[in-house]
């Protein structure tokens, strides 16, 4: 049985309904079988897991998923084999395979493989500030989301009106989400916003830094 | 020699049932995909229906969905097609046709006509 | 359902001509494509599945190709005994349809 399946991988929003294309071409016999099962990304094939069986005309939706998932057409025996899998959620992102058995039609493996990545917006990301802040001093801006598909960009505003830094003085990394202030001076003080975007969304954090003469305290 | 026989054919009105048979030989008959394909009189090639090789899995196209119903007998090596609710517009040669491995019919039979007339 | 439309509908030709007949899918059928060829009053023989493969017993001078949605059939040096009438199929998912059909008479 030959297997067809989308080249590109699948993304589908967090709560959405995945549907997951798995055609085929066979004269389908009483011992067509076909199998749908799952691999958390980063984990070899051996390590799939079943979620969904037909057999027998017969369909057997199993593991954690099984309240989940469906299929197109049931009975999948006209060529399409294709999932459903609804309310996604973030652990359903990884490899779906979709196996197609039906002897003596042995002239391939039958065996075709979807990426699946479910897209979630960035979470309230954490801002948190490390370094020294007396004039002259440098510190280091972080902003990172526990949550979000693509990973986020990060990217760090300063609110309100100031003056414009000396070049240099503010790097910032989009993909870490750090911002190093270096030669601070007390205008450096103020309130630094970090936005965390993907393609589904943004969401934000804030932090004020103080900027003191060297022979006091830095306040945060 | 791969062999299938049709009958059954006539003439009916419309409405009427009509049930055709196909008789298969020089092969596993039990091991095959077997399809009616129909041909209307001066007309192309319609598949009709079609039949898993132990009879599990049945499928129609809309044309003739819930008036149709193939089956076999794989003890007698037989095809056969009920046909009801009978339309003039299935007035059609109908040929029986083993599947190959992939749904494509690699043997015909010489089929059999069937007038759907008042 | 995927729609299958041959061309020419009709295709006059001489002995020994080269002869190619097309078959457009409305989808892509990768090559799940099979031709058909029909004399009067007879049944349809089996002359190409999966778009290029011979069964045994067909005549080289029948060849397929093409994939996706394009699809040819050609007849290398036409012979007495071709002219008929050839119908492609789609052996992908069901409903399994077939071309309308191209006739190969004699010019």
């Known amino acids: 049985v030959e297997v067809k399946v989308p080249t590109e991988p699948l993304s589908t929003p967090l709560g959405k309904t995945a549907e997951l294309t798995c055609t085929y071409s066979t004269s389908v016999g009483d011992s067509f079988a076909l199998e749908w099962s799952f691999v958390q990304p980063g984990k070899p094939i051996s390590e799939s897991h079943p979620i969904l069986y037909f057999t027998n005309g017969h369909l057997y939706p199993t593991g954690s998923k099984s309240k989940r998932v469906s299929l197109l057409q049931n009975p999948p025996t006209v060529g399409v084999a294709t999932l459903k899998l609804t309310d996604v959620h973030p652990s359903d992102t990884g490899t779906y395979l979709c196996q197609v058995n039906n002897p003596p039609d042995f002239y391939t493996n039958g065996l075709g493989l979807i990426n699946l990545t479910v897209l979630v917006p960035p979470s309230n990301p954490l801002c948190s500030q490390s370094g020294q802040t007396s004039v002259g001093g440098s510190t280091a801006l972080r902003c990172s989301s526990s949550e979000g598909a693509p990973k986020p960009v990060y990217n760090w505003v300063r609110l309100g009106t100031f003056p414009t830094p000396s070049p240099g003085s503010m790097v910032q990394d989009e993909v870490s989400g750090q911002l190093i202030l270096t030669n601070l001076s007390l205008t450096s003080s103020g309130t630094y916003r970090c936005v965390a975007t993907n393609q589904m969304g943004s969401a934000s954090c804030e932090l004020t830094l103080s900027v003191t003469e060297p022979s006091q305290g830095r306040v945060a | 020699e791969v062999q299938l026989v049709e009958s059954g054919g006539g003439l009916v009105k419309p409405g009427g049932s009509l049930r055709l048979s196909c008789a298969a030989s020089?092969?596993?008959?039990?091991?095959?995909?077997m399809s009616w394909v129909r041909q209307a009189p001066g007309k192309g090639l319609e598949w009709v229906s079609s039949i898993s090789d132990g009879g599990l899995y049945t499928h129609y196209p809309d044309s003739v969905k819930g008036r149709f119903t193939i089956s076999r007998d794989n003890a007698k090596n037989s095809l056969y097609l009920q046909m009801n609710s009978l339309r003039a517009e299935d007035t059609a040669v109908y040929y029986c046709?083993?599947?190959?491995?992939?749904?494509?019919?690699?043997?015909w039979g010489q089929g059999t006509l069937v007038t759907v007339s008042s | 359902d995927i729609q299958m439309t041959q061309s020419p509908s009709t295709l006059s030709a001489s002995v020994g001509d080269r002869v190619t007949i097309t078959c457009r899918a409305s989808?892509?059928?990768?090559?799940?494509l099979a031709w058909y060829q029909q004399k009067p009053g007879k049944s349809p023989k089996l002359l190409v599945f999966?778009?290029?493969t011979l069964p045994e017993g067909v005549p080289s001078r029948f060849s397929g190709s093409g994939s996706g949605t394009e699809f040819t059939l050609t007849i290398s040096s036409l012979q007495p005994d071709d002219f008929a009438t050839y119908y492609c199929?789609?052996?992908?998912?069901?409903?399994?349809?077939f071309g309308q059909g191209t006739k190969v008479e004699i010019k």
């Open positions: 999966n778009a290029e």
């Open positions: 989808e892509n059928i990768y090559s799940y």
């Open positions: 199929q789609h052996h992908y998912v069901i409903p399994w349809t």
């Open positions: 020089g092969f596993t008959f039990s091991n095959s995909g």
């Open positions: 046709a083993r599947q190959g491995v992939r749904p494509f019919f690699d043997y």
